[in-house]
């Protein structure tokens, strides 16, 4: 009888099925939808989380101006194809043979096409701008306290190395968090900024992916930080390829 059998759950991903039938009675957890083994000591990739979500029962001035090439996820949920490491495949298609290319966070970066569409490589999203508006408070938050609290959150809750939180900007009521991570900077074992941003997004929406952990309770010097609107912009290492028709629409 082992500790694994007493507590066979995945602390970092509630969308898993776990059983104590791994080597030596260890707990083994697999993602819903894909059946892929997940590492419960770190964040699960966004692709596997989206796949699990789609398989689940349906019930449920100092500010940065986003670049002209920044993408916003307007397409919403889809059932993605993930590679053997859990990353998004560069080309995604739906059941009606409509295909498109995505970046490393699974956001569409080309016009939609047919099965002949080619996506040569998975383009990395190296810069993520999280744009938040907080609910009215008695006064503005202290910028350095806010900065420290958000950096702590990404370090402790999402296990993102501090060097990847490039900046925190604040101009009441807007908060912007900049995450930057080039391919060359990301070492083995580093949490991906796309995965951290997705966990943060779900936390902000009150849909925490963590197992049995309370929801996100963000406080700055004891004052609750309640977010009323979130926009996330994704910037890729190679600019997206949309037709002029879409850009002028």
């Amino acid at each position: 009888h082992t500790a694994a059998q007493d507590n066979c759950t995945c602390p970092t991903n509630k969308m898993t099925v776990c059983s104590p039938d791994g080597p030596g009675g260890r707990c083994q957890c697999r993602a819903l939808g894909s059946g892929m083994a997940v590492d419960c000591s770190t964040l699960t990739s966004k692709c596997l989380l989206l796949k699990a979500r789609m398989s689940a029962p349906k019930n449920a001035r100092t500010l940065v101006r986003p670049s002209e090439h920044a993408l916003v996820d307007n397409d919403g949920l889809y059932d993605p194809d993930c590679d053997p490491e859990g990353r998004f495949k560069a080309r995604q298609c739906n059941q009606t043979s409509v295909c498109w290319c995505v970046n490393s966070v699974g956001v569409r970066r080309t016009d939609k096409g047919d099965l002949s569409l080619r996506c040569d490589e998975l383009v990395r999203t190296h810069h993520i701008l999280i744009d938040l508006r907080h609910r009215p408070t008695a006064g503005a938050f202290n910028h350095s306290d806010l900065d420290a609290e958000l950096r702590r959150l990404f370090r402790e809750r999402y296990r993102l190395h501090p060097k990847f939180v490039a900046a925190v900007h604040y101009e009441q009521p807007t908060i912007q968090i900049e995450l930057r991570q080039n391919t060359s900077q990301k070492a083995a074992g580093d949490v991906d900024i796309g995965d951290a941003a997705y966990y943060f997004e779900r936390d902000i929406k009150g849909e925490s992916l963590f197992q049995g952990r309370g929801g996100l309770d963000l406080r700055v010097r004891g004052e609750p930080l309640q977010v009323e609107r979130t926009l996330i912009y994704y910037l890729d290492e190679i600019p997206p390829k949309f037709s002029m028709k879409r850009l002028t629409a």
Partner: nanobody
Amino acid sequence: QVQLVESGGGLVQPGGSLRLSCAASGFPFSSADMSWVRQAPGKGPEWVSYINADGSKTYYPDTVKGRFTISRDNAKNTLYLQMNSLRAEDTAVYRCARAKLTDTHYVEDYWGQGTQVTVSS
């Protein structure tokens, strides 16, 4: 870049034997724990053997215990699976995987493309 390439699969009669190999590259093989994982049609993946980095510790589920043997040659960066007394229910795609054990959890993080093993008369 981690690469795992399996070979040795094929068609074998019930009661027969096969030896699978997995050539590893792109990571320090001699310090990595490894597993063999199989997936039968319409079923989820299941681990069938595990070996630690120096080969001193192995684990098998009851379904294959006494019939399968995992081994490794760290000088050749190669993992092996000797399968004896094969049964029809052993039919699956077999993949080698880089693995790790913690006090409580087991996880695989890289897999090969796999080699098909079919047991049929």
